[in-house]
């Protein structure tokens, strides 16, 4: 079954996908598509890279990480409910029947209706909205949605906990990750 990721309407959604290049700059073609991975390539492609660069992308879909180091995680800007569904990340590892494919399920929730912002809420809004926890592999990865409203003391406490907990693990360890070579 697909790993599930969540975002709110109006937010940017993040779908992790990684590989480790065999050598620096030795890139592998990757495609992202809306819909589960087909037998070859990606269906309904929204972004693709080749051995050198991103060679196709559509509006609102981009790679925020360093794809030259194998971070091919997809960011979808300003999501709407229509962005819900399965997304395919396909890594075309050279060789016979070597492709790695990952189906990620994006769930979009309606935006919360909130009262007029206060200083406390402004600070909350500035706090990172997407946290990723790491289980024992991609199948157990979960992405948390917006954090609940919390006060300054809670933020300080949470920051300390983050520093000492698995939540502080690099995002690289949380998504679909494969090593080449």
């Amino acid at each position: 079954s697909e790993v599930e990721y969540r975002a709110e309407v109006g937010q940017n959604a993040y779908l992790p996908c990684f590989y480790t290049p065999a050598a620096p700059g030795n890139l592998v073609p990757v495609c992202w598509g809306k819909g589960a991975c087909p037998v070859f390539e990606c269906g309904n492609v929204v972004l693709r890279t080749d051995e050198r660069d991103v060679n196709y992308w559509t509006s609102r879909y981009w790679l925020n990480g360093d794809f030259r180091k194998g971070d091919v995680s997809l960011t979808i800007e300003n999501v709407t409910l229509a962005d819900s569904g399965i997304y395919c990340c396909r890594i075309q590892i050279p060789g016979i029947m070597n492709d790695e494919k990952f189906n990620l399920k994006l769930v979009i929730k309606p935006a919360k209706v909130t009262p007029a912002p206060t200083r406390q809420r402004d600070f909350t809004a500035a706090f990172p909205r997407m946290l990723t926890t790491r289980g024992h592999g991609p199948a157990e990865t979960q992405t948390l949605g917006s954090l609940p409203d919390i006060n300054l003391t809670q933020i300080s406490t949470l920051a300390n906990e983050l520093r000492d907990s698995r939540l502080a693990n690099d995002l690289r360890d949380s998504g679909a990750t494969i090593r080449i070579g």
Partner: antibody
Framework: QVQLQESGGGLVKPGGSLRLSCAAS????????MTWIRQAPGKGLEWISY????????YYADSVKGRFTISRDNAKNSLYLQMNSLRAEDTAVYFC????????????WGQGTMVTVSS | EIVLTQSPSSLSASVGDRVTITCRAS??????LAWFQQKPGRAPKSLIY???SLQSGVPSKFSGSGSGTDFTLTISSLQPEDFATYYC?????????LGPGTNVDIK
């Protein structure tokens, strides 16, 4: 005009070899994945091999695995199928077809080249 | 391997008829189904991809529908040039497989 043209077919004895070519024109060849599909006389269509646009990713049908090799030369806009250890059941018209990377589906087909394996 | 079954295997129809061909997959294939048309001695021609999307240049008298395991190709008004064999193909799972074909001939 987008076009695919196969060549290299002919009569060959069982156990022999043949190399098919598919010349592409009218599009940026390296952007598209390519496949070989065959059709035995009076029969249906059978997919046999896939190669990605850059040539790195390759798939074969079990029926030809270890005997056939797909390759491409993007500088020459050409696709190839090296067929070794040919058998009578490989007798067919061989088509090359272009895969649309945007949808993952086949969109353009060549006219085909006939391969006959017989003693 | 996913097996595709087409029905009918052949049909006779007249010019102007509405013709429907079905393709059933042995397991779910999402919407990764294509339809091809082939005339005797000719190369196949791609008609439909993703179950219902028309390939560029294909007339709108052809339409596709379905998802999961059951799919349909419809020709709204059969013309003389439409008499041919029609194949469905799934490209959801390895290996890609094709149906046995449906031959549409003149009544």
């Amino acid at each position: 005009q987008v076009q695919l043209q196969e060549s290299g077919g002919g009569l060959v004895k069982p156990g022999g070899s043949l190399r098919l070519s598919c010349a592409a024109s009218g599009f940026t060849f390296s952007d598209y994945y390519m496949t070989w599909i065959r059709q035995a006389p009076g029969k249906g269509l059978e997919w046999i091999s896939y190669i990605s646009g850059g040539g790195g990713s390759i798939y074969y049908a079990d029926s030809v695995k270890g005997r056939f090799t797909i390759s491409r030369d993007n500088a020459k806009n050409s696709l190839y199928l090296q067929m070794n250890s040919l058998r009578a059941e490989d007798t067919a018209v061989y088509f090359c077809a272009r895969g649309n990377w945007g949808s993952a589906a086949l969109d353009i087909w060549g006219q085909g080249t006939m391969v006959t394996v017989s003693s | 391997e996913i097996v595709l079954t087409q029905s009918p295997s052949s049909l006779s129809a007249s010019v102007g008829d509405r013709v429907t061909i079905t393709c059933r997959a042995s397991q779910g294939i999402n919407n990764y189904l294509a339809w091809f048309q082939q005339k005797p001695g000719r190369a196949p021609k791609s008609l439909i991809y993703a179950a219902s999307s028309l390939q560029s240049g294909v007339p709108s008298k052809f339409s596709g529908s379905g998802s999961g395991t059951d799919f349909t190709l419809t020709i709204s008004s059969l013309q003389p040039e439409d008499f041919a064999t029609y194949y469905c193909q799934q490209y959801n799972s390895y290996p890609p497989t094709l149906g046995p074909g449906t031959n549409v001939d003149i009544k």
